[in-house]
């Protein structure tokens, strides 16, 4: 099957302190290759989650990426702050034959609002 | 430290069941997958069964599937391998395994011997 | 199936390089056991392809290309003779296979 990484949702917002979730879903796992997502783009952006293992806080999976099959590479950011506005975006690579690895695909971003929390 | 510990292996009959444990610690055990991995006398390693870190999805290797049934208590830091039909050719030394995210295996249990023989 | 040497024999002090075939590149991860003694536990030294743990000294190092994987042992020591396993994840399949196993000896 042709790999397609997809974030269906283009924005969304959440108040400051409160949980939002990023979906992103693949339609293939190959080639072989880790997910990451990052905000921003370009040199200048920011590594938000990898699935390869290490702990990121504030930010774990919502679906259980052990599944030899996942597909669902979504992602749950805690304690929002205005600080993590800006485009979120779901990254497929492919293994390098030597590091690093090789980027083959990127959803098409989710950019998140952070309002204000209620007073 | 990563410790896995085996235990339930034990001299059983042809046709007998066993059911060997691992129990883990320290490691978010609920956070990964696992293997089992044996190891005939005189032979190679050889892959058994995976299982997700939640415990919904199994994997097997054809040659168990249908006899060998792997499972997991999260909340006893327990990976389990119940083995039925056994024959003479399921004596081994039996070892469960952390997977990495891409499913390979970085720490492994000491082993558990399982011996079938009448 | 994963197509190791049964054996490779060299000097202290040698670079060791350990091949496995049989794998394909665009579907499968390799990784690296160390068993010493028949029956003991084995260590792992390279998954990942590539990915050292910390505990495994820095002479031990894995690459992938193509359809193969390499287990490179720089400067090997007495303390390196064991049997070596190559092992792939296929992510085609869903399937871990291990190679026969490679004896090194140390001279």
């Known amino acids: 099957k042709e790999l397609k990484v997809t974030q269906p949702e283009k924005s969304v917002s959440v108040a400051a302190g409160d949980s939002t979730v990023l979906n992103c879903t693949l339609t293939s796992l190959l080639p072989v290759g880790p997910i990451k997502w990052y905000r921003g783009v370009g040199q200048s952006r920011l590594l938000i989650y990898s699935f390869t293992g290490e702990h990121f806080p504030r930010v774990t999976n919502v679906s259980d990426a052990t599944k030899r099959n996942n597909m669902d590479f979504s992602i749950r950011i805690s304690n929002v702050t205005p600080e993590d506005a800006g485009t979120y975006y779901c990254v497929k690579f492919q293994k390098g034959p030597s590091e690093p690895d090789t980027e083959i695909q990127s959803g098409g971003g989710t950019e998140v609002y952070v309002l204000a929390k209620p007073s | 430290d990563v410790q896995l510990v085996e235990s339930g292996g034990a001299v059983v009959r042809p046709g007998e069941s066993l059911r060997l444990s691992c129990a883990a610690s320290?490691?978010?055990?609920?956070?990964?997958?696992m293997s089992w991995v044996r190891q005939a006398p005189g032979k190679g390693l050889e892959w058994l069964a995976g299982?997700?870190?939640?415990?919904?999805?199994?994997y097997y290797i054809d040659s168990v599937k249908g006899r060998f049934t792997i499972s997991r208590d999260n909340s006893e830091n327990s990976l389990y391998l119940q083995m039925n039909s056994l024959t003479a050719e399921d004596t081994a030394v039996y070892y469960c395994?952390?997977?990495?995210?891409?499913?390979?295996?970085?720490?492994w249990g000491l082993g558990t011997l399982v011996t079938v023989s009448s | 199936a994963l197509t190791q040497p049964a054996s490779v024999s060299a000097n202290p002090g040698e670079t060791v390089k350990i091949t496995c075939s049989g794998g394909?590149?665009?579907?499968?991860?390799y990784g690296w056991y160390q068993q010493k003694s028949p029956g003991s536990a084995p260590v792992t030294v390279i998954?990942?392809?590539?990915k050292r743990p910390s505990d495994i000294p820095s002479r031990f190092s894995g690459s992938a290309s193509g359809s193969a994987a390499t287990l490179t042992i720089t400067g090997v020591r007495v303390e390196d003779e064991a049997v070596y396993y190559c092992?792939?994840?296929?992510?085609?399949?869903?399937?871990?296979?291990f190679g026969a196993g490679t004896t090194l000896t140390v001279l």
């Open positions: 299982i997700s870190a939640g415990g919904s999805d199994t």
């Open positions: 998954h990942s392809d590539d």
């Open positions: 394909d590149w665009y579907s499968t991860y």
């Open positions: 395994a952390r997977e990495t995210w891409n499913h390979l295996f970085d720490y």
């Open positions: 320290g490691f978010t055990f609920s956070s990964y997958a």
């Open positions: 092992a792939g994840y296929d992510g085609r399949t869903y399937i871990n296979t």
